[in-house]
Interface confidence: low
């Protein structure tokens, strides 16, 4: 019985199409596949950012694969050919590994890259990113931001920079069509006459960095002798009501502080007839049904009742 062997894929490479971290891994079939014409050859692909403890593993019949990477670090990948057991009378046969790496040659010392990059998607409508210049960089240094997400033909440069001292320290993005629930890639690079500037790469999903507007139209309604219903409305904008969580802060007679997190635009509060003053504020955040993370809105304007009979049907500011 001759041992069945198969070669690894040929021309295995990582290709950077200029999408700021979204890379193509591609390869060609192994040599000498003639013996296995009736067989569908598969490939096991493993890849990771250098320094990561775990490999991502994909088994595919295709000759390419695409995924996002952190270009601040290098990338390593390996692939081998798999012959399923149907082709080899009983046991799966694997080739040796073909390996490749990719990294962007870093320019400049790490301190020159932008510091404290912060991006917020205001009300699921307006993306704004800001940063601080690198440590010790000079006034002639300027930073440029580029971004890409699936659906754009190529990476775009920011067209509306926020400036301080003539330096770009942020970017106001234009309307970003069909940009949520997918990876959003950013590169901030820089130029200086005096020294090379290190580029920085960032990846996030827009729905996870949403800061909503605060709730509006806060009202009180007496439900019974010992219950008051607090109500508010969702703010204007594209975020549907089902996507909100709310946090309420309630003060009774300047002594009790109640905080609660609720999913609806109402909260029922137990009170006593002695309550002389009631105030509450609300803030909102995108919930786990619509995103993996989010940023609390600012607090709403305060709504207060004081000095009157709380049995009045509605108390509206």
């Amino acid at each position: 019985d001759t041992e069945i062997k198969v070669n690894p894929p040929q021309d295995f490479e990582i290709v950077d199409p200029g999408y700021l971290g979204y890379l193509y891994l591609q390869w060609q079939p192994p040599l000498s596949l003639d013996h296995f014409k009736e067989c569908t050859v598969e490939y096991e692909l493993k890849y990771r950012n250098i320094g990561s403890e775990t490999w991502k593993t994909i088994i595919t019949k295709n000759l390419h694969y695409k995924d996002g990477f952190d270009l601040n670090k290098g990338i390593e990948a390996k692939i081998h050919t798999l012959l399923p057991w149907q082709c080899t009378n009983g046991s799966e046969v694997q080739s040796s590994w073909a390996e490749t790496t990719y990294w962007i040659s870093p320019q400049g010392i790490p301190e020159t890259k932008v510091q404290d990059m912060d991006c917020v998607y205001y009300n699921w409508q307006y993306l704004l990113c800001s940063w601080k210049p690198g440590i010790g960089v000079l006034l002639d240094t300027n930073y440029n931001l580029f971004y890409w997400y699936e659906g754009l033909d190529h990476a775009l440069q920011c067209v509306d920079y926020i400036k301080a001292d003539g330096q770009n320290i942020g970017c106001r993005f234009p309307y970003l069509e069909a940009s949520d629930y997918k990876d959003f890639y950013i590169c901030v690079n820089g130029s200086s006459e005096n020294k090379p500037i290190r580029s920085s790469y960032f990846t996030f999903q827009l729905q996870n960095i949403v800061k909503p507007l605060p709730p509006v139209y806060l009202t009180f309604t007496r439900e019974s002798s010992c219950e008051i219903k607090l109500k508010w409305s969702i703010p204007l904008g594209p975020i549907p009501a089902r996507c909100f969580d709310y946090e309420i802060e309630i003060r009774e007679d300047d002594t009790t502080l109640v905080t609660a997190t609720v999913e609806n635009e109402t909260y029922t509060l137990k009170t006593t007839n002695e309550t002389r003053q009631l105030c509450f504020v609300v803030r909102s955040k995108v919930n786990i049904y619509c995103s993996d993370d989010g940023i609390w809105s600012e607090w709403s304007d305060k709504q207060c009742w004081e000095g009157e009979d709380l049995s009045k049907k509605t108390l509206l500011r």
């Epitope: 800001s130 002639d140 301080a164 942020g170």
Partner: antibody, heavy 119, light 111 residues
């Protein structure tokens, strides 16, 4: 190392003008703003304004808009502040201070020039 | 103009203890996620020396005994442990908008 050299003292008559100098060395002069700050004896600090030596752009505290004129001579890496129509209220120590940008603070200061206005 | 109010105006703290100086701005000095607040130390006959910039970042060559914190309108400078050499005036300064303004100063003495 970074140095900002200022004359120790100037004595001037009321109504006259004086031009204070600040000679920079140890760094690229045009890469940093030059700020000017006033300090009267036993009093606080007042920011007068700043100049970008690269482009000549100036930002003034409105309070000093008619009092101070900021200029630079790039060839000698020197910043100047001219004070005009001097009164006793202008008697103070005037510092020049290098600043990289709004969020970086004024990281190097001259020793200050003491201006005395008296007849 | 943004007014900065420092407190206390003076304080005396024992050697090795912690000194805390506060600075309150009449309006927020935050912008683009940055707090435009700086702290200076000034000794008699000397120019001010930058200790802290952007609210919490240390000036070059300053000892780790000096730390800054805060955002929006409320900021503080902490010095711990105090040394003899820390006797000085301390000023906060905002650089969010022109005109840049200083606090009135805090005189720190070592007991």
């Amino acid at each position: 190392q970074v140095q900002l050299q200022q004359p120790g003292a100037e004595r001037v008559r009321p109504g006259a003008s004086v031009k204070l100098s600040c000679k920079a060395s140890g760094y690229t002069f045009t890469n940093y703003w030059m700020n000017w700050v006033k300090q009267r004896p036993e009093q606080g600090l007042e920011w007068i304004g700043r100049i970008d030596p690269y482009a000549g752009e100036t930002h003034y505290n409105q309070k000093f808009k008619d009092k101070a004129i900021l200029t630079v001579d790039k060839s000698s890496s020197t910043a100047y502040m001219q004070l005009r129509s001097l009164t006793s209220e202008d008697s103070a120590v005037y510092y020049c201070a290098r600043g990289y940008g709004d969020s970086y603070g004024m990281d190097h200061w001259g020793q200050g020039t003491s201006v005395t206005v008296s007849s | 103009d943004i007014v900065l109010t420092q407190s206390p105006a003076s304080l005396a703290v024992s050697l090795g203890q912690r000194a805390t100086i506060s600075c309150r701005a009449s309006e927020s000095v935050d912008n683009y996620g940055i707090s435009f607040m700086n702290w200076f130390q000034q000794k008699p006959g000397q120019p001010p020396k930058l200790l802290i910039y952007a609210a919490s970042r240390q000036g070059s060559g300053d000892p780790a005994r000096f730390s800054g914190s805060g955002s929006g309108t409320d900021f503080s400078l902490n010095i711990h442990p105090l040394e003899e050499d820390d006797t000085a005036m301390y000023f906060c300064q905002q650089s969010k908008e022109v005109p840049w303004t200083f606090g009135g100063g805090t005189k720190l003495e070592i007991k």
